[in-house]
């Protein structure tokens, strides 16, 4: 088109919230959707300077086909204003976000309510057990069968026989680890299973059951409780 | 049996420093976050710094925060506790406590095993 | 941060007779996992602190069964149901939930 024009907003719902507070080490993201013709261009200034990349360690990064400005892993040195200018021949325009990054105290890991969930399966089937944790502080997560020696779910020091089936490694991801599968299920494959998940502040965890049915059509060899796990 | 046992405390003039340790027995100390906790004179208890079992995270509390430095040697069962820029108000008894463990507990997650603490005073 | 209040500052109780010191967190320590983390620790002149209660209401291993813990959310209470000899000593709670942790003010137990 031929009908030149001054920069101008094209969605301020997206810029009506001006004050951001982020916890330390989110990730921000301020847009300032624009318009004009010619295409106007974006440039970001903070506390009324120009932003430069070397102004914070790891830098910022701007998309400008979605007018955005993207700071990862904030800390408290981001605090402050951040005003987008949009300009061109014909015009300028700006808008100010204010950033406050809230350190929040590290707190043991949350555990989401309700995860891991009981099931149950027929002999031979498969099931999973999903965990979701929430940590300020970096968490190890781990899966925990309760098992039985000698007949007894506890030693003689009155603790619980327990097995470790799964933690977090050095080439774990935090989504693999957040969920058990546990494939062709037998008898002994029944009882109580752990997400158990711990940082510099604490442990907690959540339990859940599982129970294993008799798979269709095989309720007569069924003679006998399953062996007890060693 | 489980023992923590600190040293290093003693007199030194404001602004100076000082190094503690806590030399750790019994148990699997690589396992364990660890935490320092100290004591003014007559006064209660307020917790300085903790790290986790392999010293990837540390916090501290505000008053010490930038003066302070939590470390530890899994190697050699060891915790320690760089304090710089020492001020009159640090005087206090500090104590070594283990933390959380990795695994599974019957019992406190931590905070259960105390040292006897080591006494730093901050005098001119 | 979390302010736990304890009180009273100190107590006078007879020989025999309970003693009750009360905690208030300024803001909830029960936990999602369910559990209420909360610990209660004696200390006597000279020495370190020592575990009596964890987890709101659980006795640590070795503690005498006249030592209670009880409350739920921000209101704690550590109960002494016969009071012994032994037993004089100052009192704290702490909050294990988050950094920074923090005890309670302290609570002087003397006999009557």
């Known amino acids: 088109s031929n009908n030149k024009r001054a920069p101008y907003w094209t969605n301020t719902e997206k810029m009506e919230k001006r004050l951001h507070a982020v916890p330390a080490a989110n990730t921000v993201k301020f847009r300032c959707p624009a318009g004009g013709n010619p295409m106007p261009t974006m440039r970001w200034l903070k506390n009324g300077k120009e932003f430069k990349q070397e102004h914070r360690i790891g830098g910022y990064k701007v998309r400008n086909q979605h007018w955005s400005l993207i700071m990862e892993s904030v800390v408290p040195s981001d605090k402050g204003n951040y005003t987008c200018v949009v300009e061109n021949e014909y015009g300028s325009i700006n808008h100010t976000y204010h950033l406050d990054v809230v350190e929040r105290s590290p707190h043991r890991p949350i555990l989401q309510a309700g995860l891991p969930a009981n099931a149950s399966t027929v002999v031979g089937g498969d099931v999973e057990f999903v965990c979701k944790v929430y940590s300020d502080a970096q968490p190890h997560i781990q899966w925990i069968k309760h098992v039985e020696k000698n007949g007894s779910k506890y030693g003689p020091d009155g603790l619980p026989y327990l097995k470790v089936l799964k933690a977090a490694g050095v080439n774990t991801t935090d989504k693999e680890i957040e969920v058990l599968y546990i494939r062709n299920v037998t008898f002994e494959d029944a009882g109580e299973y752990t997400c158990l998940a711990g940082n510099s502040i604490g442990i907690s965890f959540h339990s859940a059951w599982l129970t294993v049915l008799p798979a269709p059509g095989r309720e007569k060899e069924i003679t006998a409780s399953p062996d007890y796990l060693e | 049996e489980v023992q923590l046992l600190e040293s290093g405390g003693g007199v030194v003039q404001p602004g100076r420093s000082l190094r503690l340790s806590c030399a750790a027995s019994?148990?699997?100390?690589?396992?364990?976050?660890m935490h320092w906790v100290r004591q003014a004179p007559g006064k209660g208890l307020e917790w300085v710094a903790v790290?986790?079992?392999?010293?990837?995270?540390?916090y501290y509390a505000d008053s010490v925060k930038g003066r302070f430095t939590i470390s530890r040697d899994n190697s050699k069962n060891t915790l320690s506790l760089q304090m710089n820029s020492l001020r009159v108000e640090d005087t206090a008894i500090y104590y070594c406590?283990?933390?959380?463990?990795?695994?599974?507990?019957?019992?406190?997650?931590?905070?259960?095993?105390w040292g006897q603490g080591t006494m730093v005073t901050v005098s001119s | 941060d979390i302010v736990m209040t304890q009180s009273p500052d100190s107590l006078a109780v007879s020989l025999g007779e309970r003693a009750t010191i009360n905690c208030k967190s300024s803001?909830?320590?029960?936990?999602?996992?369910?559990?209420?983390?909360v610990y209660w620790y004696q200390q006597k002149p000279g020495q370190p602190p020592k575990l009596l209660i964890y987890e709101l209401s659980n006795r640590f291993s070795g503690v005498p069964d006249r030592f209670s813990g009880s409350g739920s959310g921000t209101d704690f209470t550590l109960t002494i149901s016969s009071l012994q000899a032994e037993d004089v000593a100052v009192y704290y709670c702490m909050q294990y939930i988050e950094a920074p942790l923090t005890f309670g003010g302290g609570t002087k137990v003397e006999i009557k």
């Open positions: 790290i986790s079992y392999d010293g990837s995270n540390k």
């Open positions: 019994g148990f699997t100390f690589s396992s364990y976050a």
């Open positions: 406590v283990r933390g959380a463990g990795r695994g599974y507990t019957y019992g406190p997650d931590g905070f259960d095993i």
């Open positions: 803001q909830s320590l029960l936990h999602s996992d369910g559990k209420t983390y």
